[in-house]
């Protein structure tokens, strides 16, 4: 994928609502394009932050302003509905509230669109065809919540454009204005450690590879040509400048780690893997 | 620079028909939701009917629905409204109006008069 | 259906005088209200959007205020363009629903 994106991409934007009791809430919003984060909200202000030099897109400042203007009263009205609903949805303070929605794009083009709210971290009620619908396992509570989300078929409508219109033209627009970052190659670096030894006589090799734009990555240790299937490789991380980092680790009787090596394929190496020889320095191979 | 033109409108007896179009242009047109607007003589703003950026979503105050068709042609950058068994309280300036966002109409054309009468 | 009542029906007023126009929603609609002028034989235009959002392009002697049922616009120096009617919108819940129009003419 030229954007050096996974597909299918998306653009989600996530609200994080926690209720501490009736009075005291808080909430975090961002947007993200698919697992790189491109907006926060800014709820001292009430206005969206833009990390990134291309994260307004192609939409333009009275735009932008719209869709400020749309998430403050949400965000406003969404609190006040939730407080006033709580005690007959059986809302137990604390909770916490997820919402996620946005849209997909799959070969170029838009595929779908999503809007998900969790309570306590599970699945509770989903918006479609302009909508809401209980999620089966959630009960009675779900129905409920749905009865009241549906009362006010305006917001519905706002809703759905944002999915259907709002969301699909503002990623294809991300996308054109992000290009240059996107489609960037950062090649790793990658370095050999000891991990905390595992037991007598063994030994935890560690091969970590950072710094590396995009994020698809392979990482195995090796003896000679031949994967070693022991091999575990962690979470993908991201860091503070917008590349990854991933560690992938082994555990070996001390005197079989001798003939190991750690190689790194990844898109910005040009098929030229580093390879990381246990006993030597590094090479590239 | 928004723009928005409105055509179509005339005296037309009560029963008839009346087609009333509105060219758009100075912004995306297939993005956003379209609404007509009335305004009786002398009197205030009374919202018609609005149609979703896609076409796919249609809505109508109960006043006209069933009589009035709104629709939109988003290759043309046009806007319309198909009105049938006309009365005489349908008398009025007929607006056009883009929405922004589903909050607010935040540019509307110049209006053009349609007269309902015998 | 959302009624608004405006008030009032109409005032007079000077040049530089503060002008303040109430819009009352019989039920509570949050910040989702606007304000228009319209002159003679013209169009409305948007003033204000979401109680309290200038629209671009607008003078910044306008001002919006309240949610929930009462809003006012206020404009803190009235100048001769200004004379005009204004309406209210509601756009909470459908169908969308004016306020029946404030006239401001000179003293």
């Known amino acids: 994928n030229a954007d050096g994106l996974k597909e299918p991409l998306s653009f989600h934007v996530t609200w994080i609502a926690s209720f501490y009791n009736h009075s005291w809430k808080q909430n975090l919003v961002s947007g993200w394009l698919s697992d790189l984060q491109t907006h926060t909200w800014d709820s001292n202000s009430s206005t969206i932050v833009f990390l990134c030099p291309w994260s307004r897109g192609n939409f333009s400042n009275e735009e932008w302003k719209e869709l400020e203007t749309l998430f403050r009263i949400r965000t406003i009205r969404s609190f006040e509905g939730i407080r006033r609903y709580a005690h007959e949805l059986q809302f137990e303070y604390p909770f916490e509230i997820q919402v996620t929605g946005g849209c997909e794009l799959h070969s170029g083009k838009v595929s779908g669109s999503f809007l998900q709210l969790a309570y306590q971290g599970s699945d509770f009620v989903s918006f479609q065809n302009n909508s809401w619908l209980p999620y089966p396992v959630a009960g009675n509570m779900a129905k409920h919540f749905c009865k009241v989300l549906n009362q006010n078929q305006h917001e519905n409508d706002i809703t759905h454009n944002l999915l259907s219109d709002t969301c699909p033209r503002f990623i294809l627009g991300l996308l054109d204005a992000g290009k240059a970052h996107l489609q960037r190659q950062v090649k790793p670096e990658a370095w050999l450690s000891h991990g905390p030894s595992p037991g007598p006589g063994h030994l935890q090799l560690v091969c970590h590879v950072s710094g590396f734009y995009p994020k698809p990555v392979w990482v195995m240790w090796m003896r000679g040509e031949q994967e070693q299937q022991g091999t575990q490789r962690g979470d993908i991380l991201p860091s503070a400048d917008g590349t990854w980092y991933l560690r992938a680790t082994l555990e070996v009787a001390a005197g079989e780690a001798a003939d190991l090596s750690c190689r790194v394929k990844h898109s910005s190496l040009e098929g030229q893997d580093i390879v990381l020889y246990w006993e030597h320095h590094s090479s590239v191979g | 620079e928004v723009q928005l033109v409105e055509s179509g409108g005339g005296l037309v007896q009560p029963g008839g028909s009346l087609r009333l179009s509105c060219a758009a242009s100075?912004?995306?047109?297939?993005?956003?939701?379209m609404s007509w607007v009335r305004q009786a003589p002398g009197k205030g703003l009374e919202w018609v009917s609005a149609i979703s950026g896609s076409g796919g979503s249609t809505y109508y105050a109960d006043s006209v629905k069933g009589r009035f068709t709104i629709s939109r042609d988003n290759s043309k950058n046009t806007l319309y409204l198909q009105m049938n068994s006309l009365r005489a309280e349908d008398t009025a300036v007929y607006y056009c109006a883009k929405d922004a966002l589903w909050l607010a109409f935040d540019y509307w054309g110049q209006g053009t008069l349609v007269t309902v009468s015998s | 259906e959302i009624e608004l009542t405006q008030s009032p029906s109409s005032l007079s007023a000077s040049v530089g005088d503060r002008v303040t126009i109430t819009c009352r929603a019989s039920q509570s609609i949050s910040s989702y209200l606007n304000w228009y002028q319209q002159k003679p034989g013209k169009a409305p235009k948007l003033l204000i959007y979401a109680a309290s959002s200038l629209q671009s392009g607008v003078p910044s002697r306008f001002s919006g205020s309240g949610s929930g049922t009462d809003f006012t616009l206020t404009i803190s120096s009235l100048q001769p363009e200004d004379f005009a009617t204004y309406y209210c919108a509601q756009r909470s819940y459908p169908p969308p629903k004016f306020g029946q129009g404030t006239k401001v003419d000179i003293k």
């Open positions: 100075g912004f995306t047109f297939s993005s956003y939701a």
